[in-house]
């Protein structure tokens, strides 16, 4: 008689990434009997919640339940009903909520409280909603990409992200760019991590890792743009801001009250003789780059070397995976190829930013104008951050790999977060066991 497959013995987990600009829900799946193996967890679904980030609901917390409904209902459909009660749900909020908490702990707490009450109404095993630290965000992103790349496995893996790197057990560094913060995380080469706040020690699968991480709050792409606008409007002679980071012919009216609605622009706040100003794009990459560099204070460093704003950064080491907005922006600009040099990227950015706005709108008719208008800034910001902020060079640029997904799972902190909270990354290498014989009868 023919062997019959038993119902698959699988487990599921849900993580909601409550970012500054939006919330995404991720569903993960893994074979129950292989929980401690590396690389067995994979993403089966991503659901992007319609609307802004949860911090924007501070004046309308009663709307949070409706906001989360569609994606939570999607999770109900994707995960078999028999598994609902044992499927853990975690929500991690990042820099948008960190900024709200800076303004008021109560306001942030109220938002999370309503989120928790909403998520508790579903049949899953809700494990809590919390604001994760920047250090956690960096660390979990690093764990995610190295887990998916098979870097923690002692076994030879069958896939590789780049052809020349097949069996190298050196971990990848992680570069994460969000809307409100950016993280850099990697294992330095025999370098003392001079600032304790930036040092992490892990023991994973029997190996020790000394990891450097830092999260730059206010240096995500959206908050960096607000910072740049607040800085530049200080020296504008009238209510017109001629901005090199926007395409020629682009125009947009900005409320001064919106400009100062974030703790990130506090240092540039001043009284302006107008309530609104108009951005007028002039599309000049070099000038845009120069303006962005003024956001990075490189004049002060209390360590042997720094990134910017007096933050310690060891010499860069090894390959890096650049994900989240690093990837989305560069993918849009068609600059993610391993073959594109840093000089070529810069050249292409110069051309892109110089293109007239009307031309850009025609070429990318399907893209929302709000997002489309900001790619020149975002691309220039990414280059500025990587080159001047983190000290990548034209030579080391080839060690940056712009990654969206690895083996079908999104690169980002959520998988690492779930692996940690479900205790699926053992400190010691699990004993190798013979292949499971429970699959067929």
């Amino acid at each position: 008689t023919q062997n019959k497959a038993l119902p698959e013995n699988v487990k599921y987990g849900i993580v909601l990434d409550a970012g500054s600009s939006h919330t995404s829900l991720y569903i993960y799946k893994w074979p129950a009997e292989k929980e401690n193996d590396t690389g067995v967890v994979h993403q089966v679904e991503e659901c992007r919640v319609k609307g802004p980030g949860i911090s924007k609901f501070v004046q309308k917390v009663n709307e949070i339940g409706i906001y989360l409904t569609d994606c939570m209902e999607r999770a109900r459909e994707v995960i078999p009903r028999s598994q609902h009660q044992e499927t853990p749900v975690y929500l991690g909020a990042t820099a948008g909520m960190r900024l709200l908490r800076m303004e008021s702990e109560e306001l942030a707490d109220r938002v999370l409280d309503v989120v928790e009450r909403s998520l508790s109404n579903y049949p899953f095993d809700f494990q809590g909603a919390r604001i994760i630290t920047g250090q956690e965000e960096g660390a979990y992103g690093w764990i995610t990409i190295n887990y998916l790349l098979g870097k923690f496995s002692q076994k030879t893996r069958w896939f590789s992200i780049v052809p020349y790197e097949t069996n190298n057990q050196e971990t990848f560094g992680a570069l994460d760019l969000g809307g409100a913060s950016t993280q850099v995380t990697f294992v330095p080469q025999n370098q003392t991590i001079e600032s304790p706040d930036n040092a992490l020690q892990f023991r994973l699968y029997g190996k020790d890792y000394n990891v450097y991480t830092h999260s730059f709050l206010c240096y995500g792409k959206d908050q960096a743009l607000w910072q740049k606008l607040a800085k530049d409007i200080q020296v504008a002679s009238n209510e017109i801001l001629r901005d090199p980071c926007f395409h020629p012919g682009y125009k947009k009216v900005v409320n001064v009250s919106d400009l100062y609605k974030t703790p990130c622009t506090k240092r540039f706040e001043m009284t302006l003789p107008f309530q609104q100003f108009e951005i007028q794009g002039i599309g000049n990459y070099q000038q845009c780059h120069q303006s962005i560099l003024e956001l990075f204070n490189t004049s002060y460093c209390p360590y042997s070397q720094c990134a910017f704003n007096g933050i310690f950064l060891p010499p860069l080491q090894g390959d890096f995976g650049a994900f989240s907005a690093f990837y989305f922006v560069m993918k849009f600009l068609n600059l993610t190829s391993e073959k594109v040099s840093q000089e070529k990227v810069t050249e292409m950015m110069k051309k892109f930013c110089a293109q007239p706005w009307e031309e850009i709108k025609t070429s990318y008719a399907g893209v929302k104008e709000k997002y489309l208008s900001e790619y020149c800034f975002s691309g220039t910001y990414i280059l500025s951050l990587l080159l001047q902020g983190y000290h990548f060079t034209a030579d080391s640029w080839e060690h940056i790999h712009f990654i969206g997904k690895i083996q079908g799972s999104d690169a980002g902190w959520t998988l690492g977060y779930m692996l940690n909270l479900t205790n699926m990354i053992p400190a010691e290498q699990p004993l190798s066991t013979p292949l499971s014989h429970s699959t067929y009868v």
Epitope: M102, E103, S104, L107, R110, Y260, K261, P263, K266
Partner: antibody, heavy 123, light 106 residues
Framework: QVQLVESGGGVVQPGRSLRLSCAAS????????MNWVRQAPGKGLEWVAS????????SYADTVKGRFTISRDNSKNTLYLQMSSLRAEDTAVYYC????????????????WGQGTMVTVSS | DIVLTQSPASLAVSPGQRATITCRAS??????MHWYQQKPGQPPKLLIY???NLASGVPARFSGSGSGTDFTLTINPVEADDTANYYC????????FGQGTKLEIK
């Protein structure tokens, strides 16, 4: 040292308007949420309105919603309360109060208070 | 609105003794409860924030405890200068105050 000085109080007829000001000094004004709290003669304290540090959150007590407007001018280090359609029950000492902090986070409690300005609504 | 009920409405305590004032919230406020002292003709003064943290410059004779719905302000030992009205305030929702407790020193 932190100082909050209210002004603009006085006697006003029902239905009329009044604008209170609170001049702040001794701290970085734009880093703190600010509030108005009132106290009717011989009565307890009643919160009136809040304006968070980055204007993310502006809120009013139900008793004044739609009639009072809180605002701030960070360049002048000044908090305002525009009061319109005044009623007899709005008679009180109006205090300007600063939000406190829990370490690096803002808190919705009041760590410094001004001396108050008296508003009397009477025909 | 969250209603705060203070008890007792007034109390008289001898110097050197302990004074205890309680504040009950109509719904849970986590640890977002704060205490103020107000003397006649003066603005309120912050004593305790977030249930148990002593405000700057406040003597250690003052202490606070509680979480959820039930909170306590304790003054031990009481001194003559402590004659005042005491108010609790929650900040879990838009701020509300208790009705006040009048403390007299015998």
């Amino acid at each position: 040292q932190v100082q909050l000085v209210e002004s603009g109080g006085g006697v006003v007829q029902p239905g009329r308007s009044l604008r209170l000001s609170c001049a702040a000094s001794g701290f970085t004004f734009n880093n703190y949420g600010m509030n108005w709290v009132r106290q009717a003669p011989g009565k307890g304290l009643e919160w009136v309105a809040s304006f968070s540090s980055s204007s993310t959150y502006i809120s009013y007590a139900d008793t004044v919603k739609g009639r009072f407007t809180i605002s701030r001018d960070n360049s002048k280090n000044t908090l305002y309360l525009q009061m319109s359609s005044l009623r007899a029950e709005d008679t009180a000492v109006y205090y300007c109060a600063r939000h406190g902090r829990y370490g690096g986070y803002g808190g919705f409690y009041f760590d410094y208070w001004g001396q108050g300005t008296m508003v009397t609504v009477s025909s | 609105d969250i209603v705060l009920t203070q008890s007792p409405a007034s109390l008289a305590v001898s110097p050197g003794q302990r004074a205890t004032i309680t504040c009950r919230a109509s719904e849970g406020v986590k640890s977002y409860m704060h205490w103020y002292q107000q003397k006649p003709g003066q603005p309120p003064k912050l004593l305790i924030y977030k249930a148990s943290n002593l405000a700057s410059g406040v003597p250690a004779r003052f202490s606070g405890s509680g979480s959820g719905t039930d909170f306590t302000l304790t003054i031990n030992p009481v001194e003559a200068d402590d004659t005042a009205n005491y108010y609790c305030q929650q900040s879990w929702n838009d701020p509300t105050f208790g009705q006040g407790t009048k403390l007299e020193i015998k």
